[in-house]
Structure formats: structure tokens, C-alpha cells
């Protein structure tokens, strides 16, 4: 939006569409240019000309803050924003008032105004900035500090989130996030954010507030994890009934409503968007939680945030699946298709929930710890921080447990104590306002192009260098994945979610290396879980030399900015169920395939599930629909008429450059999963 008093006068413009949506923890450049048709203004023959004066402000419902003022080449920055905002092009380009903001936090959302004054002329332009995303702490259900790096990433992915970056945790800390629990971050470091240092939480910063770090850790060490949920297309809703629901009934009720049980990440995003519900409900990971965005004593102990109901008084364990709560459902276009058994049955290992320790109760830790604070022994709850300035952290305040107005939540233990869904410390609760294969098969007459993804199962090769802390996962499969639309179209976050949607996780460098050593080759750059971009080349050729010239090996572009776009390498472990091939005379459109699988108490198989089935021996020379709208077929025994001379999962593309999904109305076979 731009304004000026009249034509032929000073005019200011911000050439960006509003609102501008940016990720928590990222940097932002807001371009602002002004045209000043006036000659230098002088007040009298003897005085020097007046220079234009630039002022940047941020406007929110509550207040207006001046960020900086610049004139005559001098820039004065509000001390609270000293290392945060700058004018990168001024005074080198005097008419360029572009603003740069570092390490965006939720509190940085608002309307940004670029105002230029020259003499009596005054003009301004505004842009709304929305900082997206929320960081939350997440813990394996059974006890504290049980996630190695790989499972930490999985835990986030299972909850519609990805593992947070250090920048995102720093931004959340600046927003008021405080958590005395060491958690993995995307760069393989382990950190935790502390505003009011105390014994047990000093870390490497002694008595200074800040994000504590243990540096880069071995990937098989175990901690909690900090996850980052970006945004959701759909909506979270609560469902109830007079008797409430068991976990299974809750899942069924959501399905009946055309929805699914929500994930923890989706609930956090809903909470961030203002959702407030004083009633606990089941989530997809079998945790029981409720979102509080209006503090009140009888509902979450006067604290804001997503509250969790625990089985045990030390805040571990999840309620018995037969206990009764509401159902928290998620409905929308961006369903992440989580199989029923994705979180395991009965076993607690992969069932993860966000949690914190009970005040004044020390949890048993997984191994001998010499420095108490390295594991944040005791956690006290803190008062929500509403507008935390960089210099004034809020004091902490212990909290009294108050039961819910309705029925209490009972522990499923012999002790007969009562659990109230509160008593955890704030977790991000500050400032919410915080086809056709190559052989001729019956099918439509369109030209399809088949890719040769040579996929190998990942097993340890004799003599292969083992990577410390990264146990090999025998029997898993690494595969290259790209959405049908185009090559190199996935940001780092989209890449992780693409793997998750396909029933897999993003591969680690070690997994890709093991696949390469077993003969895997793919001349396509793809994201890996450490935010590097790599591709494996066994037989170097001109477009695929990368950083290795004519030597074979895994090529790497190093760590890339997460906004860059590539394909992705995914990893799928074992198949929890079976993939089966379905055909009929008239074959199926994509929609018919979906309906057919569902009518057989199954779902359309995902790409990851097909890869896992291929590894287990599924061999079909007929392309079938998969859940992402792609058309693929698994070849275990290569034959000339069927997918070339190597085993692998073949993909049918629309275009010869190996992009494009088949028309959903075209007819093909089907792969279902049950």
C-alpha cells in the first residue's frame, strides 16, 4: 500500500504484495523506495539543504513502535532492535529505504510502515507481515530423553511438524519460550531455551538468560526434540458425545465427520491461531491434550498453551486408550495420511508426546549424568510472558494445581490419585497474540515416460565405513522422490513432508551413502535430513560429475538454505501391513481407485509403502495408482519388456523430462495397502 499527498510530490512504495508470510526464525527484506521530485529543500540561502528523513515503524493492535530513523546518512536504531533491523542499502543509495529484519519471531508480526519526510512533504507505504509457525517441545511418551536424532525427526514428522532449526528456537526464545529440557535441533545440536536461569538449568550460560547448547551430539545419544509446525490449510475441531470417546472411538468419530484425529503439531497451530478449549481430547499419537489461549485458574492453572494429560504423576505415560475424552479432529485439504498403526500398537517407543517434569520432582534419567544442568533436572512452571522485551524477562512463578470444573482425569494406576491436565511448564505459550509401463499393457493411448529409479535396499556393505552413532537400518529402502509437477520443486520443509506423506522419512546422509555403496545411482539432487543436498553416482557422466569430477561417489552441494528447491531422498523401513495389486477390465480412475481401496477396508498405497513392498519381493509389470496421484510399478526381476535391466520401482510420467502426473481421469490398475 502506498500513499502520497498529491501528484508530482514525494512518493513512497513497497513493491510487495501484502500480507507477506514468512517463517519464524528467518530473515526478511522489505523493499521501500521513494521518489523525491523536489530539488534539495533549503530554508534560507545560507542554510544547507534538508535531507529526506526515513522512519520505519511497526504497528500492531496494541501499539506502534518506531524501529529506526535515518537522515543525512545517519541511522538511529531503537535500542531494543539494535541487532535486529538495518537499512542495508542506505546511505549508499539515498532513495532506497529497504528494511532488513533478522531472526523473525511471532512478535514481529504486524504492519510495517516506511515513512519519508522531506521538508513539509510526507509520504508513506505499509506492508503487513505475518510470521508463520510455532516451536514446541516434544518428548517420547514413555520417559524423558529417549529420542535419538533419527527418531526425534520422525516424532516431529508424525506430528505435522519438522525438527526446528537453531534460528527458530532462538526466535521462539525471544518470543518468551522457556523450557528446561534438552532437545535435538535440525543441525544435530542439542539445546534448550532458558529465561530465568536456576540450578539444574544453567547449561553453558551460567546465570545468563539464553538458549543453552551442548553443541553437535552423536546421533545415537537420546534427548527430547524441538519441533516446528509451519501452518495448516485445514481446521481443528472438537467432537463430543454423552459418554465421550475411547481412543478408537475418537478415531472413528473423526472419520465419520470426514476428518482425522489431529496431530500435536496441528493442535499447536490451532492454539497459536486462538483456539481455546477447556476440555481434553484424543490426538493421533494417543496423547490427550487441550489448548488454552485465555488464562483462567480452573483451566490449565492460569497458564496459556497446549496442556497435556498424563498417566503418571511424574508427567510421563499416556492415558489408557479405553479411557474417555473428547475427540480432537483435523479436517482440511492437507491431510497427512497417517496409517492407523503408525504410532505402534501397545509399544511406547514411537509414541511421543510433549511433556515437562512435575515441579520439584526429579525424573530418573536414562544414564549417569555428571553435570546436573546438562539434563535440566527440575522444572518449575513459569508465568506466561506477554510482551517480552529483549531486556526484561518475566519472573518465574510456581503454580498451584487446581482441578477442572467437571470430572477429574484419573490416573490408570493402583494409587488412586487424580491427574489434572495441567502442571506442565509453558511450551511456546508466550505472546500468542504466541499407467503404462514400457511393455504393452492394456491402457489408455497416451505417451507415457517411465523413469528408471534404481532403488536398492540399504544393508551394510562388507567393509563399508560405519558412521559412529548412526546404526545401519538393515532392510530399509532409500528412494528418490519428486512430486509429479516438476523437477526440483521442494523446499527443505516440503521435502520432509513429502517423504512423510509417502509413508517414509527423509533419508540421512549415512542411509544414502549405504544405498550408494549397494549400487544406488540417481542423477538428481535431493534434500537429506541434515539440510544438505546430495546425489549418488556410481558411473560418472557429464551432467552428473558434481563435486567429485570423474570419481564415483555421493555428490554434495553442502548445507543449502531451506528455501532452495530440489527433489528429496526418502527412507522407508519395514512395511506394517500389505500392499496388494488390484485390477479389473475397465481399470480405475484415480478417484475410483481411492474408493475401491476404501471399500476393501484399505487405503491407496503410498509411494513409500510400494517401495517397502518391492523390497519384500512385490513384482508387477503393471503400473498402478498410488495415494499421491502417481503411477508406479515394482520390478524385482528385470526383463527387457518390463522396466529396463535393473530392479526398482518405476514411475510413469506424463512428459519426457520425467515430470507431470497422469491425468486423474485416465484409467490404470491400483495398489492398495491394508
Amino acid at each position: 500500500e502506498e500513499t502520497s499527498d498529491h501528484d508530482n510530490s514525494l512518493s513512497v512504495s513497497i513493491p510487495e504484495p501484502s500480507p507477506m508470510r514468512v517463517l519464524l526464525g528467518s530473515s526478511l527484506t522489505i523493499p521501500c523506495y521513494f521518489i523525491d521530485p523536489m530539488h534539495p529543500v533549503t530554508t534560507a540561502p545560507s542554510t544547507a539543504p534538508l535531507a529526506p528523513r526515513i522512519k520505519w515503524s511497526r504497528i500492531t493492535k496494541e501499539k506502534e513502535v518506531v524501529l529506526l530513523v535515518a537522515t543525512e546518512g545517519q541511522v538511529r536504531i531503537n535500542s531494543a532492535y539494535q541487532d535486529k533491523v538495518s537499512l542495508p542499502n542506505y546511505p549508499a543509495i539515498p532513495s532506497d529505504a529497504t528494511l532488513e529484519i533478522q531472526n523473525l519471531r511471532s512478535n514481529d508480526s504486524g504492519i510495517y510502515r516506511c515513512e519519508v519526510m522531506h521538508g513539509i512533504e510526507d509520504s508513506e507505504a505499509t506492508l503487513e507481515v505475518v510470521v508463520k509457525g510455532i516451536v514446541f517441545h516434544y518428548r517420547a511418551i514413555s520417559t524423558r530423553y529417549t529420542l535419538d536424532f533419527d527418531r526425534a525427526q520422525r516424532a516431529c514428522l508424525q506430528n505435522s511438524a519438522i525438527i526446528a532449526t537453531p534460528e527458530q528456537l532462538q526466535a521462539a526464545y525471544e518470543d518468551g519460550f522457556h523450557q528446561c529440557d534438552a532437545g535435538w535441533l535440525a543441525d544435530q545440536t542439542v539445546r534448550y531455551p532458558i529465561h530465568t536461569p536456576r540450578e539444574g538449568c544453567y547449561g553453558d550460560k551460567d546465570e545468563f538468560p539464553g538458549v543453552r547448547t551442548y553443541g553437535i551430539r552423536d546421533t545415537n545419544e537420546t534427548y527430547d526434540v524441538y519441533c516446528f509446525a509451519e501452518e495448516m490449510e485445514g481446521e481443528v475441531l472438537y467432537a463430543t458425545s454423552p459418554e465421550k470417546f475411547t481412543f478408537q472411538e475418537a478415531a472413528n468419530e473423526c472419520r465419520r465427520l470426514g476428518a482425522r484425529l489431529a496431530t500435536t503439531g496441528q493442535l499447536y497451530l490451532a492454539w497459536q491461531g486462538g483456539m481455546d478449549m477447556c476440555s481434553a481430547g484424543w490426538l493421533a499419537d494417543r496423547s490427550v491434550r487441550y489448548p488454552i489461549s485465555k488464562a483462567r485458574p480452573n483451566c490449565g492453572g492460569n497458564l496459556l498453551g497446549v496442556r497435556t494429560v498424563y498417566l503418571h504423576a511424574n508427567q510421563t505415560g499416556y492415558p489408557d486408550p479405553s479411557s474417555r475424552y473428547d475427540a480432537i479432529c483435523y479436517t482440511g485439504e492437507d491431510f497427512v495420511d497417517i496409517p492407523e498403526n503408525f504410532f505402534g500398537v501397545g509399544g511406547e517407543e514411537d509414541i511421543t508426546i510433549q511433556t515437562v517434569t512435575w515441579p520439584d520432582v526429579e525424573l530418573p534419567l536414562p544414564r549417569n549424568i555428571t553435570e546436573g544442568e546438562a539434563r535440566g533436572n527440575v522444572i518449575l512452571t513459569v508465568k506466561p510472558i506477554f510482551d517480552l522485551s529483549p531486556t526484561a524477562p518475566e519472573p518465574e512463578e510456581p503454580f498451584t494445581f487446581v482441578p477442572e470444573p467437571e470430572k477429574p482425569f484419573t490416573f490408570a494406576t493402583d494409587v488412586g490419585v487424580t491427574a489434572f491436565p495441567e502442571a506442565e511448564n509453558r511450551t511456546g505459550e508466550a505472546t500468542r497474540p504466541w499407467g503404462v509401463p514400457e511393455e504393452s499393457t492394456p491402457g489408455p493411448a497416451f505417451t507415457a515416460f517411465t523413469s528408471e529409479d534404481h532403488v536398492v535396499q540399504v544393508t551394510a556393505v562388507p567393509g563399508a565405513a560405519e558412521v559412529p552413532g548412526q546404526p545401519r537400518l538393515p532392510g530399509g529402502v532409500v528412494f528418490h522422490y519428486r512430486p509429479g509437477s516438476a523437477r526440483y520443486s521442494l523446499t527443505f520443509e516440503e521435502a520432509q513432508q513429502a517423504c512423510l506423506r509417502t509413508g517414509a522419512v527423509i533419508a540421512s546422509p549415512e542411509q544414502l551413502q549405504a544405498a550408494y555403496e549397494a549400487g544406488y545411482e540417481q542423477c538428481d539432487a535431493g534434500w537429506l535430513q541434515d539440510q544438505t543436498v546430495r546425489y549418488p553416482i556410481v558411473s560418472p557422466r557429464t551432467p552428473c560429475v558434481g563435486d567429485k569430477d570423474s570419481s564415483p561417489g555421493v555428490r554434495t552441494y553442502g548445507v543449502r538454505p531451506p528455501s532452495e528447491t530440489y527433489d528429496v531422498y526418502c527412507y522407508v523401513d519395514k512395511l506394517e501391513g500389505e500392499v496388494f495389486f488390484i485390477t479389473r477390465l475397465e481399470q480405475f480412475t484415480f478417484q475410483e481407485a481411492l474408493a475401491f481401496c476404501e471399500s476393501h477396508n484399505a487405503t491407496l498405497a503410498s509411494t513409500g509403502q510400494l517401495y517397502a513392498a518391492w523390497r519384500q519381493g512385490l513384482d508387477k509389470c503393471y503400473a498402478g495408482w498410488l495415494s499421491d496421484g502417481s503411477l508406479r510399478y515394482p520390478i524385482v526381476t528385470p526383463r527387457p519388456s518390463c522396466g529396463g535391466d535393473k530392479p526398482g520401482v518405476r514411475t510413469v510420467y506424463l512428459y519426457p523430462n520425467q515430470t507431470g502426473l497422469p491425468d486423474p481421469l485416465s484409467r490404470h490398475h491400483v495398489f492398495c495397502f491394508r
Partner: nanobody
Framework: EVQLVESGGGLVQAGGSLRLSCAAS????????MGWFRQAPGKEREFVSI????????VYADSVKGRFTISRDNAKNTVYLQMNSLKPEDTAIYYC?????????????????WGQGTQVTVSS
Amino acid sequence: EVQLVESGGGLVQAGGSLRLSCAASGRSFSSYAMGWFRQAPGKEREFVSIISWSGGSTVYADSVKGRFTISRDNAKNTVYLQMNSLKPEDTAIYYCAAGRLYRATPRPADFGSWGQGTQVTVSS
């Protein structure tokens, strides 16, 4: 399902107040989210407010925030809508509704039971 009967509507001057009541008969009132919707002549039915089954959580349409308050008394099987600082644009038929869903943006389809409505007219 529950049966719903609204009362308390009428004619009031701009700036005035009214309190609408909705009495429910039938079983398990306390397991229903209760909502108020309104429909002005020639317009679609629009959401006004919702209260959760426990009464602990509420949502309001932006147009009524700060002026209207929803509450419920589960012992009396009744939900209330206190309307203050009324404006001519609040003129409509107000409907009470009961449903098993609760979300930030309630929609009529979330509610399985509806009252007959009560007329509210705000004169300037």
C-alpha cells in the same frame, strides 16, 4: 436429539440491551456445544457465538465481540445470550442451536438441533 425453544427477543433502541434464553429439553444437554446464529432479511444465516459443552470455552463473531456474552447453566438446561450496546445492524431472527462439534469457525452444519428463532429488532 434435544428440542430448543428461544425467548427474550423484542424491540429495543440502539444502545440498549436484551437477554435471549434458549431452553433445551431432552437428554444429556451437557454434552452439546450450544450456539447462537442470526439471519437478517435477505441474508444468509450467520454465526454469532458458541459455548463448549463444559461452558469453559467460547467463541464470538468479530461483529459482536465485546458486546455480546454467551453463557450456559447445565443444571437448568439453558443457554443465554446477553446482548449489550445493540446496533440497528443487529436486527435479525436469532436462532439457538445444539451440536456435538466445537470449532473456531462454527458453521450451521455442525448443529443437529435448531430452535424456531426469536425476533430482535433494534431501532435507531
